[in-house]
């Protein structure tokens, strides 16, 4: 049976096998199609998501579409129910919790009072002055916390306490990538991940170990990746992957947040990377415990330079290292988060690519997340 | 010196098919993309589809989805466009154009390959 | 699909004329822009990608700007053999799209 599921795959009505290699081919094999159902799948961009949050104390924003402006949501009147569709909007299907926090001197935005329509925020018509003096910060799901601070060194083994969001993504139980907890049903990960086997049968997920052999398996429901740009071929480099049972949340699987979508980090800005991969350019080998390491922003501009990426890396992507080089995401990393820490720690890149590993003038590049919310907002309503 | 050569001119019946050709030298053939683009008598650019010869994946325009198809051949570095179920409206020159390798826009195209379609 | 419109459609100068076009994107797209010159019964050439990136062997006095929906090719001094229509596309969002064209032609 083991020998049977490693290299055929069985179709239904009539019962027949085809090899394994014909599934997600895009040639409908067996009778019913079926092993072109259980396929990476594609998904666009979709329509703006008219529900956003800001840095500046998570506050919730609301799209006005006629205009095509945006609005702070003042706290009058705002209620759980309220909260609730605002999350559900990004696709979240966790109980939201909220405050106010006080209009801050710095707000630019005008505020105004929210009303729900047809399942959406909407702006109250006849909305007077924000009475309360306060607008609503608002959290979705509880995420970022850790039970472990790492300390700022450069490489060291890492432990899950720090990163209980951190996953090991396999293919026939051979670690492929790196990936993130978002929420219990969502792992982020990179598209290119999945460029070989593009089969979900096979992928699992391992959650809650520091360790790469040591941890059970989950099952994987779907793997959702965003529509190719054939102008930006390295753009879009992300992916969702379902699992088929919700995590159980505890000390050592925990979800990161998401970035704010007005999340710009400056150069030099200290961040986090973490995995599995390669210890060294063509290493040829696997970590076998997790590794940490602090990097920081490296200015696109300078990224970009004749002695570098030369124009490669686009808006939707960010550098990340250290200027001297020799602290780099490799092989194996990839699809593992870029972590900043404020509040809350933030996925705020995913590993991509680079010309080799650690060099000087070309760090690692990594899929901006802020870039792509709207993207994942889309996803998650759509699996609601 | 990078040239990329079309096929000549056809003349086509509506219904029938047209398949035409580029053939690329002087660079690595599979390590750029290819797209075609299109453009009717007195009208504007028109985007067609893409291909990674490297991968053979290809990918289409909506409004071509069905009667497009994109294939290659390594061993001769050329690119092949076929479109079906042929029109009048498809009457147009039909362009390859290979993309930047660092992507962004197309930085070599083909001399172009007049398509007409008339009863 | 994003769609991309130009302005003018046409316009006429003379040699030596500071010559601006425009192209807008009806949706934000970053610096995912590029633009061609076209002359009659030639292939497009590139001229300019991430909005203002001048393509090697394109002459100096080619320069685009912008950001997002409103984007700008300028032609500092018009020279004879700039005469030609030009295009603006997006590559920010599938499908790519082109803009109308603006054709440029001697008063």
């Known amino acids: 049976k083991v020998i049977l599921d490693k290299y055929y795959f069985l179709c239904g009505q009539p019962l027949h096998f085809i090899p394994r290699k014909q599934l997600c081919d895009g040639e409908l094999d067996c009778p019913l199609g079926e092993d072109e159902e259980h396929c990476v799948k594609s998904f666009p961009e979709g329509p703006a998501v008219a529900v956003r949050l800001s840095k500046d104390r998570s506050t919730l924003q609301v799209l006005d579409s006629a205009t095509g402006n945006w609005f702070s949501a003042c706290f009058d009147n705002f209620t759980e129910a309220l909260a609730e569709t605002a999350c559900r909007q990004m696709g979240y299907s966790s109980k939201p919790t909220f405050r106010a926090v006080e209009i801050g001197p710095d707000q630019d935005l005008d505020v105004v009072e929210i009303t729900e329509n047809s399942q959406e925020l909407r702006m109250r018509n006849s909305s007077g002055p924000c009475l309360s003096g306060s607008l609503v910060s608002l959290h979705c799901l509880a995420c970022g916390k850790s039970l472990k601070t790492p300390r700022v060194v450069g490489v060291e083994e890492a432990s899950v306490d720090s990163w209980p969001w951190q996953v090991s993504i396999q293919y026939d139980k051979q670690h492929v990538c790196g990936g993130s907890i978002l929420d219990p049903h969502w792992v982020l990960t990179a598209a290119h991940c999945f460029r070989k086997h593009t089969d979900v049968f096979n992928w699992k997920v391992r959650a809650g170990s520091d360790k790469l052999g040591s941890f059970p398996s989950l099952a994987v429901a779907k793997i959702i990746i965003i529509e190719f740009n054939p102008m930006y071929p390295k753009d879009n480099d992300i992916a969702l992957m379902k699992l088929q049972f919700p995590l159980t949340f505890s000390g050592t699987v925990r979800p990161i947040c998401l970035p704010f979508f007005d999340e710009e980090l400056t150069p030099a800005t200290p961040l986090w990377i973490i995995g599995w991969g390669f210890t060294k350019q063509n290493g040829g080998k696997m970590s076998d415990i997790l590794l940490q390491a602090s990097v920081q922003v490296i200015d696109s501009t300078r990224c970009n330079a004749d002695d570098a990426y030369q124009g490669e890396v686009t808006e939707k992507m960010m550098c990340a290292g250290i200027p001297e080089g020799g602290v780099d995401t490799c092989q194996g990393d990839s699809g593992g988060p870029l972590m900043y820490q404020s509040d809350q720690w933030h996925v705020v890149g995913i590993v991509s690519w680079g010309y080799g590993c650690g060099g000087p003038s070309t760090p690692g590049v990594y899929t901006k997340v802020s870039a792509y919310l709207n993207w994942i907002y889309n996803v998650w309503k759509a699996e609601l | 010196q990078v040239q990329l050569v079309q096929s000549g001119a056809e003349v086509k019946k509506p219904g029938a098919s047209v398949k035409v050709s580029c053939k690329a030298s002087g660079y690595t053939f599979t390590g750029y993309y290819m797209h075609w683009v299109r453009q009717a008598p007195g009208q504007g650019l028109e985007w067609m589809g893409w291909?990674?010869?490297?991968?053979?994946?290809?990918g289409y325009a909506q409004k071509f989805q069905g009667r497009v198809t994109m294939t290659r051949d390594t061993s001769t570095s050329t690119v092949y466009m076929e479109l079906s179920s042929l029109r009048s409206e498809d009457t147009a020159v039909y362009y390859c154009?290979?993309?930047?390798?660092?992507?962004?826009?197309?930085?070599?195209w083909g001399q172009g390959t007049l398509v007409t379609v008339s009863s | 699909d994003i769609q991309m419109t130009q302005s003018p459609s046409s316009l006429s100068a003379s040699v030596g004329d500071r010559v601006t076009i425009t192209c807008r994107a009806s949706q934000g797209i970053g610096n995912y822009l590029a633009w061609y010159q076209q002359k009659p019964g030639k292939a497009p050439k590139l001229l300019i990608y991430a909005a203002s990136s001048l393509e090697s062997g394109v002459p100096s006095r080619f320069s685009g700007s912008g950001s997002g929906t409103d984007f700008t090719l300028t032609i500092s001094s018009l020279q004879p053999e700039d005469f030609a229509t030009y295009y603006c596309?997006?590559?920010?969002?599938?499908?790519?799209?082109f803009g109308p064209g603006t054709k440029v032609d001697i008063k």
């Open positions: 291909m990674n010869p490297n991968s053979g994946n290809t």
């Open positions: 596309q997006q590559g920010y969002r599938f499908p790519p799209t």
């Open positions: 154009a290979r993309l930047r390798a660092k992507g962004g826009g197309f930085d070599y």
